[in-house]
């Protein structure tokens, strides 16, 4: 009888240890989940609000075809402008066509008038070639009109209807670009 009770007690203790272990694992899993959830919720909120509003672009961004554009309200140097765009999940504007250039310059005229706006174009110091930030070459009609006389790095900017060049360390507004969300409907 005593042996039977002792065996039951041992089994209960073993069960208890297993449950404690499971609880520990669950607590650890819950902590890990909470961290994942924090970022997952942020992503889902973005996705849901976009889906709910059926809006392909975030608030304060302008849409044209497959792209969304953000026109900054602050000045910064070219490299900081790029960083500011990355924070928003975008890159500096990359103008692919005359049509896109016309849309941008037309929009700028409506929004702000004739200011300077950094775009994602820079001149290679060695070869002197102009390249977009993704490494592609601009089409012949979209090369900066003037060569900057700067010994420093040279970057491209838009002003009025023109693409111009300047020392990358000068302060200008900037334009970010990201892909518009595709409607699944």
């Amino acid at each position: 009888k005593l042996l039977q009770v002792s065996t039951i007690a041992m089994q209960q203790q073993e069960k208890l240890i297993q449950q404690e272990r499971a609880l520990l694992n669950f607590t650890e899993w819950k902590r890990s989940c909470a961290l994942q959830m924090k970022y997952c919720q942020a992503f889902m909120q973005n996705s849901l609000s976009s889906a709910h509003n059926s809006s392909p672009c975030p608030n304060n961004w302008i849409q044209n075809r497959e792209s969304c554009y953000y026109v900054s309200e602050i000045w910064s140097i070219w490299h900081t402008s790029q960083e500011n765009c990355l924070k928003e999940g975008s890159t500096l504007l990359q103008i692919e066509s005359k049509e896109e250039m016309d849309f941008i310059t037309g929009s700028l005229r409506k929004i702000k008038g004739s200011y300077d706006y950094w775009v994602g174009l820079s001149q290679d110091g060695h070869s002197g070639r102009w390249l977009w930030q993704d490494g592609s070459s601009p089409s012949p009609g979209l090369l900066p009109a003037e060569r900057s006389q700067s010994a420093n790095q040279v970057c491209g900017y838009v002003k009025s209807n023109s693409l111009l060049s300047s020392n990358c360390s000068t302060w200008k507004y900037f334009i970010c670009e990201k892909y518009a969300l595709r409607s699944s409907v």
Partner: nanobody, 115 residues
Amino acid sequence: QVQLVESGGGLVQPGGSLRLSCAASVSIFSINAMGWYRQAPGKERELVAAITSGGRTAYADSVKGRFTISRDNSKNTVYLQMDSLKPEDTDVYYCKAYIRGEDYWGKGTQVTVSS
């Protein structure tokens, strides 16, 4: 706390290749953009390459045509394929993530290009 772990650095001869990896502890769907930066002693960190959640890319002039950034969403990892390496590419390479207005950095991986 988001953790970024870089790997793949090492010693390579000029003209050689390396592939750096940056693994994130959270889903990279929640990350606006990820970038690779490098820093030589006594100098500021500079952007080498970046990729946004939508897949747009940006490169420093000095690496265009030689380096390629890519991402694997299923592995929560961003890669930097470095080809035609030059001695001036020698640096500590850091991974950076932009999440909802906050920046997170990895601890870095050393890349040395030398014969």
